[in-house]
């Protein structure tokens, strides 16, 4: 009888050891999965945006230094233009320097000629200050020439080589900007 109990106890202990081993394996597997998921996610986020294309900018976007630009082929009001850019993982163009302004106006001349293009600049209704969409102020040389007498909200646009202002509800082309993908080589 005692031998029988002792045998059962040993079997139970063996089962317990096996279960502990299985649990340990499962925990390791889970941790490894979580780690792989993290790597996979990072890899996906990097590779998805380049989608079989190792160039720093998506197709139909223009590159200059660390930025990619998209010149729209449709008209829209300023707020819809911003929405359209966000859907592309970008924002309306934010011009940081005269060099960037020259590049943009030079590119526009080649692509389309003298049209109006919304950029990410708007005038605060209360203070009258011009601000880029990220909240920063434009450099003094990049303030729109006062052209709008609108009582409505006023936004900035590029035409030829000038930065101008207009009622945000008017229809214009627009330019989106996103960061260029850094080459991993």
């Amino acid at each position: 009888k005692l031998l029988q109990v002792s045998t059962i106890a040993m079997q139970q202990q063996e089962k317990l050891i096996q279960q502990e081993r299985a649990l340990l394996n499962f925990t390791e597997w889970k941790r490894s999965c979580a780690l792989q998921m993290k790597y996979c996610q990072a890899f996906m986020q990097n590779s998805l945006s380049s989608a079989h294309n190792s160039s720093p900018c998506p197709n139909n976007w223009i590159q200059n230094r660390e930025s990619c630009y998209y010149v729209s082929e449709i008209w829209s009001i300023w707020h819809t233009s911003q929405e359209n850019c966000l859907k592309e993982g970008s924002t309306l163009l934010q011009i940081e320097s005269k060099e960037e302004m020259d590049f943009i106006t030079g590119s526009l001349r080649k692509i389309k000629g003298s049209y109006d293009y919304w950029v990410g600049l708007s005038q605060d209704g209360h203070s009258g200050r011009w601000l880029w969409q990220d909240g920063s102020s434009p450099s003094p040389g990049l303030l729109p020439a006062e052209r709008s007498q609108s009582a409505n909200q006023v936004c900035g646009y590029v035409k030829s080589n000038s930065l101008l202002s207009s009622n945000c509800s008017t229809w214009k082309y627009f330019i989106c900007e996103k960061y260029a993908l850094r080459s991993s080589v």
Partner: nanobody, 115 residues
Framework: QVQLQESGGGLVQPGGSLRLSCAAS????????MGWYRQAPGKQRELVAA???????AYADSVKGRFTISRDNDENTVALQMNSLKPEDTDVYYC?????????WGQGTQITVSS
């Protein structure tokens, strides 16, 4: 499909602060931008703040300098830190994700700024 779960709304006094958080799940790899919109009764939903997958930010004029949007790509969350709140910030705030040219929305969270 992208699912969004918001948290952090409530009642706050003018001049106070609140932090909204939104967690995304589902097809998170396709998200191009995430952000917050607000909507007052009978009005259109308007952008408050957004952040792209590359980290570019956009804010509504009325919140510039007061609100800050941030994104944690590891946790797939977007947060909106709201400081110096005003009574006119009272609204229902919706988390938004833009993926594959579609808009996905959270259920909305009420923020009331009142003394």
């Amino acid at each position: 499909q992208v699912q969004l779960q918001e948290s952090g709304g409530g009642l706050v006094q003018p001049g106070g602060s609140l932090r909204l958080s939104c967690a995304a799940s589902g097809s998170i790899f396709s998200i191009a931008a995430m952000g917050w919109y607000r909507q007052a009764p009978g009005k259109q939903r308007e952008l408050v703040a957004a952040i792209t997958s590359g980290g570019r930010r956009a804010y509504a004029d009325s919140v510039k300098g007061r609100f800050t949007i941030s994104r944690d790509n590891d946790e797939n969350t977007v947060a909106l830190q709201m400081n110096s709140l005003k009574p006119e910030d009272t609204d229902v705030y919706y988390c938004n994700a833009k993926a594959d040219h579609n808009d996905y929305w959270g259920q909305g969270t009420q923020i009331t700024v009142s003394s």
